[in-house]
Interface confidence: low
Amino acid sequence: NIDVCKLGTVTVQPAPVIPLGSAANISCSLNPKQGCSHYPSSNELILLKFVNDVLVENLHGKKVHDHTGHSSTFQVTNLSLGMTLFVCKLNCSNSQKKPPVPVCGVEISVGVAPEPPQNISCVQEGENGTVACSWNSGKVTYLKTNYTLQLSGPNNLTCQKQCFSDNRQNCNRLDLGINLSPDLAESRFIVRVTAINDLGNSSSLPHTFTFLDIVIPLPPWDIRINFLNASGSRGTLQWEDEGQVVLNQLRYQPLNSTSWNMVNATNAKGKYDLRDLRPFTEYEFQISSKLHLSGGSWSNWSESLRTRTPEEEPVGILDIWYMKQDIDYDRQQISLFWKSLNPSEARGKILHYQVTLQEVTKKTTLQNTTRHTSWTRVIPRTGAWTASVSAANSKGASAPTHINIVDLCGTGLLAPHQVSAKSENMDNILVTWQPPKKADSAVREYIVEWRALQPGSITKFPPHWLRIPPDNMSALISENIKPYICYEIRVHALSESQGGCSSIRGDSKHKAPVSGPHITAITEKKERLFISWTHIPFPEQRGCILHYRIYWKERDSTAQPELCEIQYRRSQNSHPISSLQPRVTYVLWMTAVTAAGESPQGNEREFCPQGKAN
């Protein structure tokens, strides 16, 4: 218990608080009749230095004065900023078994005088708020430092408040607790901050302000919006404000937007009409206020009002496409497809689509509504048919979009020329073409259609398509394009009543196939061998297969194999070869080639032709 100090006292010269870099003398004195019993001359006073409760030094070498058995003085230097504890102990040297006994202790604080406070800033929040000022205290003093904020103004107005900083709390803001009213709008006020601690004091420069300089209006509250006649584009924004507000700033944006629409409103009196809203859109609205047109500060933004504008009837034109398949000699299946309207065109939740198929001459009409984006019907193969689709929400329907049903690939003269497909990057394919050479009617538009070449893709997946104006000869397709997958791409040229098409395969990225085709049979017919195979499984193709290669060599031969390269056709799964010797056993295998290279070989089959060779 060093603070009881029954055995003696510890004193510090010049003081327990010293400036950084100064030295101090610490004297430890025993009280009368205290010390080592029987042997006063054996009293040894030692001084121990602690930082954060840890003993860091025994200062026996720093003694500058010693009255044997009674008192000792130690000089301490190089003390670091903050508090250091020194404990004086009595060591009775004749008795080694007993530990030194604490005599007394002292804390020495090392710090600096306060710097003049700077950057004083005062605010009054709202007309009924109180004046609060903050400042920059400068360097940490490491000592308890008192700060006094003084305000003076007209009519002998004076006011002051105090706070202090130490190692647990910081004082750089004070609320004076007084309210400045608008009738003092032209008056000037002066504030000053004074700092004082054990090592000195300092004062800020005076800071002058007016009512308008410091009063920040409260942000507007109770924000609401009324939509005129349930309009999705026009609404009146309303709010509550403090009485003195003359200027408002409104900002609003759709929730997924990154930029605000900004509006300034003078003397709005809590009301403003907005006329350019998007129907069926989630909006965020905020308002700020100011007390004076030219001076003063804007309030903080109000809390957000988030609301959705009402629906309006859809606008825009649906993008329609179709597929035609003959079922038998007098019936065909028409599958209509359309793309969803984007939100700015839908202007609400699309409840259904109205689909119409009409035979132009006989006036036969098939009508239906569907919630899907496709519709299939079987109709007669005779007659000229037209289709129309419109989208409906709770407020109405869009204008119907019409398309003539023609034989999409029926007119060879309308087929685009020199169609090519080049991979642009991992998820794009650039399709280019030349116009039909001898079209007897004008091309109204091109349709680029694509579908993954995988089993069942025609029945399972709707096509993807792009409409291209007649003067464009290229399209960058990206929707649903994945790397290492082969797509069938068709370019349709459409006139008023006819269609022509050209087809090509393409991929956005390719690798050599994982495996080669699997030879399933080798048969001999009319002195020719027919090799039959199964195609490589779709996931192992890794792009568009350009060629198959059939390899053969005599069994046990070390010579290079012969090969036959055949153009890849999806429908083809056999091929003849005719350069093999009869009654010689051959080993045959196949590989597949993409633009990235050749696959490993497929299975090997042995075969010995029996017939007469060519």
Epitope: L48, F50, D53, V54, L55, V56, E57, N58, P99
Partner: nanobody, 122 residues
Framework: QVQLQESGGGEVQAGGSLRLSCVAS????????TGWFRQAPGKERELVAG??????YYADSVKGRFTISRDNAKNTVYLQMNSLKPDDTAVYYC?????????????????RGQGTQVTVSS
């Protein structure tokens, strides 16, 4: 008379771990401070870790790698040493004080062990 006995030293590769134990016998009091010191050849003895009540102290050179802990039921204090470096090679001593918190000064400790050798090779 309190006696302290260290164990757990030995040779280990850099990056390895050791756990030193210090068993106290003959103690009749329970309030104490324990320090683990080390002394490398030609260097001063230094405090690497201290424990007083629930408060711990670590030298900067071992912070985050060494952990001091106590099992009162077994009268044992441990020093878990991880990510050992060749610089950690030294004789490690355990010491106890009956009065005061951890001290950097070896002479301030009332009871001291004989030490255990720790060698870290690269």
């Amino acid at each position: 008379q309190v006696q302290l006995q260290e164990s757990g030293g030995g040779e280990v590769q850099a990056g390895g771990s050791l756990r030193l134990s210090c068993v106290a016998s003959g103690r009749t009091f329970s309030v104490y401070t324990t320090g683990w010191f080390r002394q490398a050849p030609g260097k001063e003895r230094e405090l690497v870790a201290g424990m007083s009540g629930t408060r711990t102290y670590y030298a900067d050179s071992v912070k985050g790698r060494f952990t001091i802990s106590r099992d009162n039921a077994k009268n044992t204090v441990y020093l878990q040493m991880n990510s050992l470096k060749p610089d950690d090679t030294a004789v490690y001593y355990c010491a106890e004080r009956r009065y005061g918190g951890p001290s950097l000064v070896w002479d301030e400790y009332d009871y001291r062990g004989q030490g255990t050798q720790v060698t870290v090779s690269s």
